[in-house]
Each structure stands twice: as structure tokens, then as C-alpha cells.
Interface confidence: low
């Protein structure tokens, strides 16, 4: 074992390091003392060290780790940070486009639903991305009530355009028969099916990405333990004590004393590791009708072959809806 | 024949000019994010070493220092953290997680199982065809220019695939970088059935 | 112009593996899938699997998995393709293709590889 | 998987002439569907996709028709260079499959 050496006789480099930590010289001795009021850095002989210096070492030891943690978290933690709201732009950008290309298909294919089309659609598409920031909205509904309030316009306007202006009374009806009589035949299920499908997995995509971040934020704001900030003392500065200025902790000793501060923060890993492999398999599965960007661009094309199905059944539907509003009609027409 | 807007599209003379090469989806994105995420998969496990590694630790000194003395760097003391009689590394280790990282493992847990859950294929339709349900997905009328994907996947895309990332705000990648690209020449005003199935596995 | 540039004819022994490559070139490589197709002499077309090479990834027609590795190195633009446990039913001609847009259209293909598997 | 099946196997016809390849899926694959000519000894030419949308540089003799399972080729005014065999293919999703081809030869 190599003999210790000679103290600092005059403590004059701790005294010259000390004071980078902490400006005023008050706390740091003269001369090497006995230090037996130190609680970490326990001499083996005469130290330079005070009990006013060993806390400062210690609360500047877990600030050096809250740091290094931070450091260490640093990329990953923009990355996920950055995604996410990539992401939740991009995905409003989705619904701004499919919003766009549906107002387009009325306007280019059926002008005489606009402007309440317009509005039944918007509604439609601010509910989307209600959905998908973690409203409590329900998809079916949602679907339910844009085909509801398009069959009264489709049928005033498209299929009987004779009608008088819709009054509340056949519009309640035409709702009603909406569902009743499958006036879209499957669309609106084909199209809840792929709408419900590709948000739940959009929506908790994002709610991943967002945990992912809190995740991070939890682990580099944690407050070390007294025993660790000891530890950490022990390691990094009580070698100063003896006015051993340029010596580092060995390698070994460091892993065993991160993993002592760090035993808390280790026990996420297995989370962590089954967190990106679900997202991961989350991910592979985003595709066809779990794909939002696919579904909701679609969405315009396959109102509009719903609204052909309609017409394509319209002298069927006009016949039998004539029977079942026959009461509202007529007192419209009074 | 349905009549759609020129407005849908990217201008034919623009097509001509198009960098087809910097087209960017939302699906090669997300892989992307998975693949880098990836990466970090060890990140709290590695974190002790991390730290170790970025702090100074004696590397090529032939002296380093073991908490309480100076010792030879490969000496059976230099592993040793000399606290005798100070406090207990191991109770320190049985203490067990915060309640901050107690609760956040919870979070953890439960988006795992979310996560899992949406990914399961049983608790999927993919192959579950709507035809069966009543759709009537004979052929698309006579004059129509597109299709719909009747078992629920097969969905149009219009010709000019949107390159949502390049109107984000945000500096990603070079490689990323998006930009003007062509999904086909669109002939006369037609839709096509011609879409995203590039993530499709 | 696009081009999809693939290695020479390939003769291998029963039981070896071989890697087959495909150079592109005229776009860029990251953007679009690269697929594999199979042909055997006189028969139909087969596709065995695609490559993105922005992110590495390959996805495998199912009675390929095992036998097709895909590969994609962006630094060279270059897709490859290894087969293993090589058959006298490898024997074929191996083109690659590159998606036209996002999905399994094909407008553009390698002039293919003939490999021959014989001892 | 998705089935293609096409006839006929082959087919001999004269320059001039007007020939039609069918092509039918094993199930409904709506419009998403693609023609390829293959030469002796080359590699396959993009000639339709979407069932009806002919590849650039495709001459107008070619043109695609159908739609679910029931799908066409016409080739009218048959030229020198059209002779080769003719493939469809889905492109409706995983794995995308080929048909079984249909030769067209010089009468």
C-alpha cells in the first residue's frame, strides 16, 4: 500500500478550492484540526476539512448528481419531447386536411348541402381532434351525429328537393328513419369502425409519448438521500480533507456507489424496457385502419360514395320515408 | 364522373419539379422514433455507469482514491468503498423507490398495459370483413373514378400525399427533411384509389 | 434517371447462403421502399419482401421468413437481400423493385439476379 | 392470400388485332390492382395501376378496366413490342401477389 502523503501544512489548496465552492474563507482551518466532529469524510490523521465544509460538499455533491442526471437524460429526453409535439401537430394537421378535402368533396360534387354540410362536417372534425388531445367523446356518437344531421339536408335537398325549407319537426324524423331504414347502408359502421380504431391508437400514442416525457421529468428532478449525498461526499471530496487535490475515485467504487444513490431510479428499467417494446409493437400495428393519417384522408372519398349509395336507393327510401314522415311532411306543408 | 378540385392536388407543373425523394410520412416517423427510442432501451440500468462515465474517475492514474484512503487503481481495495461503521450501502439499496418513482412505475405500468392491449391482434377486426355485415361492396358505379375500401383498410388517398412534417415548425433531420413529392400524374380530375400503403406489414 | 442496378448471376452449392445487392440510383434512396420479387424459370412472380431503408426495416411475405434477410445500407443507397439454406427451389431469378409512391405498386425494377443453387 | 388468377394462359393473335386479359381475385380487392409486361429475359414494365390509370409512358392502345374481383387488360391494335407475357398484381395490401401470367405470342 503506498504511505499516504504528506498533509497540506498550511491546508492552503483546500483553502484555494474551497473557496470556488463557497466564497469566504471562514469555514476552512488554517492548519490541518483532528476533525472529530466530521460525520463522512472521517480522518485517519489531522484533515483539512471543518463540519461546515462537509455539508457544503454534500449538498454541492447531489447538486453535481441532480446535474449529471440531468445531462445524462438530456437527448432522450428532447427526443421524446420534440416527437411529441411533432406528432400532435402533425395529427391536427391530418384532421385541418381531411376537414379541408370533405368541405372540397360537397362543395365540387354536392354545392346545394353546402354551407350546413360545412357545418355538420366541422363539428365532426373538431370532436376528432378533441378525441385524440383525450376528450371523453364517444366515436360512434360522433359518427352518428354527423350521418344524422346529413340525411335531413341529403333528403331535402338531394332526394326530394320539391320540399319546402326543413322544419324541425321532419328533420326529427328523418334522423329517426336514418338509422331505422340503414339510409347509408354500412357506411357509418365501416366508417366508426375505422375512425374509433385509428384514434384509440393515435390518442394513446400520445398519451405514451406524453408519459414518456413525465417519465423522464420525474427521474431527472429527483432529490438525492442524505446517505447518498454521503456517499457521493466520500467519493468526490473527501480526498481534499487530506490536500489529495488531483486524485479521482476509483472506477469500481463509483459503479458501487451510483448504483447505491441510483437503486430507486434502476427499478424503472424494466418498465422502461416493456415501455418502448409496447410502443414499439403500437407502432408496427399503425397501419390500414389504425392508421389516422389513412383513415381520416379517406374520409371525404367514402362520405362521398355514401351519399351515391343514398342515391343510388333513392327512389326506394323516398317511397318508404314518405310513408313514415308522412305526418311531418304534411303539416310542412300546410 | 365526379368532378374534384385542381385544388386538391399538387399543380401538374410543379409535378414535373417535385423532390420525390424527401416525401415524409407519419408512419416512417414514428418508425423512425421507435428505432431511435430504441436506443435508449438500457438508458436507466446504464445510468450508474453513465454517470461514473461522465464524472471523473480514475481512468489512467495508477493511484485512485476508494472514499477513505489512496490505493493502487487495481488493488482489491480499490473496489472497496471503506464505510465501516458509517451507514449500510445495502440498506441503503433495500430502501426501495420514492413515492414519486413509485407512482411513476404505476403510470408505466398501466400505459404498458394500454399499450399491449391496443397491440393485441385478437383484440383486432383486420381481418373481420365488413362485407359480411351487410355492406354491399359490389363494383363501383359505372361512372365513378374511385373505390372504397370495403373491408375497412383499402381507404383513398388523394394524389398529393400531405407532407404534414415540412409544415411543422419544427428543424428535424436533414435526412427528414420533406419535401414537394408526387404520388402518380393525375390524369384529368380523377381521385385515385392510389394511397399510403407503404406502412401496411 | 431512376435505376436499380443488381449483382451479376450467382451459382451457390445446397446449404450455403448468398447476398444479392441492388444499387439505386436517380432518387432518393431513403424515401421509398425497396421489394424483392422472385421468378422462377418459366413461372409467375413472387414477392418476397420489402425494405425501408430509412429506418432499416424489413417486412417479409410470411413463406419467406427465414429463408430472406433484407438489408439496407443508406450510406451506399444499395438493398440487399441474403438467402440461406439454399435449395435447388432457390434457384430463380431475384429482381428488386421500387414502390411508386407508399405502396405495392412497383415502377421501377432491377434487370435481376440469376442465381443457381447445384453441387 | 389474395389469389390472382388469369386467362388465358395464352394467347396467339396478329399485329392489328384487339386482345383482352382478364384477371380475377380470390377476393374483393376494389380497384387496387396492377398490370405488368414482361419481356423475354427482362424485367417487368408498369403499364396500369389503380385498375384503370395507365403508367406514364404507356401508349393509349393500352387500357385497365374492373373492380372487385373481376379485372381487364385491352390491348387494341396490337403492335410488334406488345408481344411478351402479361401479369396483374394487388396492391391491396401484404404480401402483394402476381397472377398467373398469360403469354401473348405472334400468330
Known amino acids: 500500500q503506498p504511505p499516504p502523503p504528506p498533509p497540506d501544512a498550511t491546508c492552503h489548496q483546500v483553502r484555494s478550492f474551497f473557496q470556488r465552492l463557497q466564497p469566504g474563507l471562514k469555514w476552512v482551518p488554517e492548519t490541518p484540526v483532528p476533525g472529530s466532529d466530521l460525520q463522512v469524510c472521517l480522518p485517519k490523521g489531522p484533515t483539512c476539512c471543518s463540519r461546515k465544509m462537509e455539508e457544503k460538499y454534500q449538498l454541492t455533491a447531489r447538486l453535481n448528481m441532480e446535474q449529471l442526471l440531468q445531462s445524462a437524460s438530456m437527448e432522450l429526453k428532447f427526443l421524446i419531447i420534440q416527437n411529441a409535439a411533432v406528432f400532435q401537430e402533425a395529427f391536427e394537421i391530418v384532421v385541418r386536411h381531411a376537414k379541408n378535402y370533405t368541405n372540397a368533396m360537397f362543395k365540387n360534387n354536392y354545392p346545394s348541402l353546402t354551407p350546413q354540410a360545412f357545418e355538420f362536417v366541422g363539428e365532426f372534425f373538431t370532436d376528432v381532434s378533441l378525441y385524440i388531445l383525450g376528450s371523453d367523446i364517444n366515436v360512434d356518437d360522433m359518427v352518428n351525429e354527423l350521418f344524422d344531421s346529413l340525411f335531413p339536408v341529403i333528403y331535402t335537398q338531394l332526394m326530394n328537393p320539391g320540399l319546402p325549407d326543413s322544419a324541425l319537426d321532419i328533420n326529427e324524423c328523418l334522423r329517426g328513419a336514418r338509422r331505422d331504414l340503414k339510409v347509408f347502408g354500412n357506411f357509418p359502421k365501416l366508417i366508426m369502425t375505422q375512425v374509433s380504431k385509428s384514434l384509440q391508437v393515435t390518442r394513446i400514442f400520445l398519451q405514451a409519448l406524453n408519459l414518456g416525457i413525465e417519465v423522464i421529468n420525474t427521474t431527472d428532478h429527483l432529490k438525492f438521500s442524505k446517505d447518498c449525498g454521503r456517499m457521493l461526499t466520500r467519493m468526490w471530496y473527501c480526498s481534499y480533507c487530506q490536500g489529495l487535490m488531483m486524485v479521482k475515485p476509483c472506477g469500481g467504487y463509483c459503479n458501487v456507489v451510483m448504483q447505491g444513490c441510483m437503486a430507486g431510479v434502476v427499478e424503472i428499467d424494466k418498465y422502461w424496457r416493456e415501455y418502448i417494446l409496447s410502443l414499439e409493437e403500437l407502432v408496427n400495428g399503425m397501419y390500414r385502419i389504425y392508421d389516422m393519417e389513412n383513415v381520416l384522408l379517406g374520409l371525404f372519398s367514402t362520405i362521398h360514395d355514401s351519399i351515391q349509395y343514398v342515391q343510388k336507393n333513392a327512389g326506394k327510401l323516398t317511397t318508404t320515408i314518405g310513408k313514415l314522415c308522412a305526418h311531418s311532411q304534411q303539416r310542412q306543408y300546410r | 364522373s365526379a368532378y374534384y378540385p385542381e385544388d386538391l392536388f399538387i399543380d401538374k407543373k410543379v409535378l414535373k419539379v417535385a423532390h420525390v425523394e424527401h416525401e415524409e410520412t407519419l408512419s416512417s416517423r414514428r418508425r423512425e422514433l421507435i428505432q431511435k427510442l430504441k436506443s435508449f432501451i438500457s438508458f436507466y440500468s446504464a445510468l450508474p455507469g453513465y454517470i461514473c462515465s461522465h464524472s471523473p474517475v480514475a481512468e489512467n492514474d495508477t493511484l485512485c482514491w476508494n472514499g477513505q484512503e489512496l490505493v493502487e487503481r487495481y488493488s482489491q481495495k480499490a473496489a472497496r468503498n471503506g464505510m465501516k461503521n458509517q451507514f449500510n450501502l445495502h440498506e441503503l439499496k433495500m430502501k426501495g423507490p420514492e413515492p414519486v418513482v413509485s407512482q411513476i412505475i404505476d403510470k408505466l405500468k398501466h400505459i404498458n398495459q394500454l399499450l399491449r392491449t391496443m397491440s393485441m391482434p385478437k383484440g383486432r377486426v383486420l381481418d373481420k370483413n365488413l362485407d359480411e355485415e351487410g355492406f354491399e361492396s359490389g363494383d363501383c358505379g359505372d361512372d365513378e373514378d374511385e373505390c372504397i375500401g370495403g373491408s375497412g383498410d383499402g381507404m383513398i388517398k388523394v394524389k398529393n400525399q400531405l407532407r404534414f412534417l415540412a409544415e411543422l415548425a419544427y428543424d428535424l433531420d436533414v435526412d427528414d427533411a420533406p419535401g414537394n413529392s408526387q404520388q402518380a400524374t393525375p390524369k384529368d380530375n380523377e381521385i385515385s384509389t392510389f394511397h399510403n400503403l407503404g406502412n401496411v406489414h | 434517371q431512376v435505376q436499380l442496378q443488381q449483382s451479376g448471376t450467382d451459382l451457390a452449392r445446397p446449404g450455403a447462403s448468398v447476398k444479392l445487392s441492388c444499387k439505386a440510383s436517380g432518387y432518393t434512396f431513403t424515401s421509398f421502399g425497396i421489394s424483392w420479387v422472385k421468378q422462377r424459370t418459366g413461372q409467375g412472380l413472387e414477392w418476397i419482401g420489402e425494405?425501408?431503408?430509412?429506418?432499416?426495416?424489413?417486412y417479409y411475405n410470411e413463406k419467406f421468413t427465414g429463408k430472406a434477410t433484407l438489408t439496407a445500407d443508406k450510406s451506399s443507397s444499395t438493398a440487399y437481400m441474403e438467402l440461406r439454406s439454399l435449395t435447388s427451389e432457390d434457384s430463380a431469378v431475384y429482381f428488386c423493385?421500387?414502390?411508386?409512391?407508399?405502396?405495392?405498386?412497383?415502377?421501377?425494377w432491377g434487370q435481376g439476379t440469376a442465381l443457381t443453387v447445384s453441387s | 392470400d389474395i389469389q390472382m388468377t388469369q386467362s388465358p394462359a395464352s394467347l396467339s393473335a396478329s399485329v392489328g388485332e384487339t386482345v383482352t386479359i382478364t384477371c380475377r381475385a380470390s377476393?374483393?380487392?376494389?380497384?387496387?390492382l396492377t398490370w405488368y409486361q414482361q419481356k423475354q429475359g427482362k424485367s417487368p414494365q408498369l403499364l396500369v395501376y389503380n385498375a384503370k390509370t395507365l403508367a406514364e409512358g404507356v401508349p393509349s392502345r393500352f387500357s385497365g378496366s374492373g373492380s372487385g374481383t373481376q379485372f381487364s387488360l385491352k390491348i387494341n391494335s396490337l403492335q410488334p413490342e406488345d408481344f411478351g407475357t402479361y401479369y396483374c398484381q394487388h396492391h391491396y395490401g401484404t404480401p402483394p401477389t402476381f397472377g398467373t401470367g398469360t403469354k401473348l405470342d405472334l400468330k
Open positions: 377476393e374483393n380487392i376494389y380497384s387496387y
Open positions: 423493385a421500387k414502390d411508386f409512391g407508399s405502396s405495392y405498386v412497383f415502377d421501377y
Open positions: 425494405i425501408y431503408p430509412r429506418s432499416g426495416s424489413p
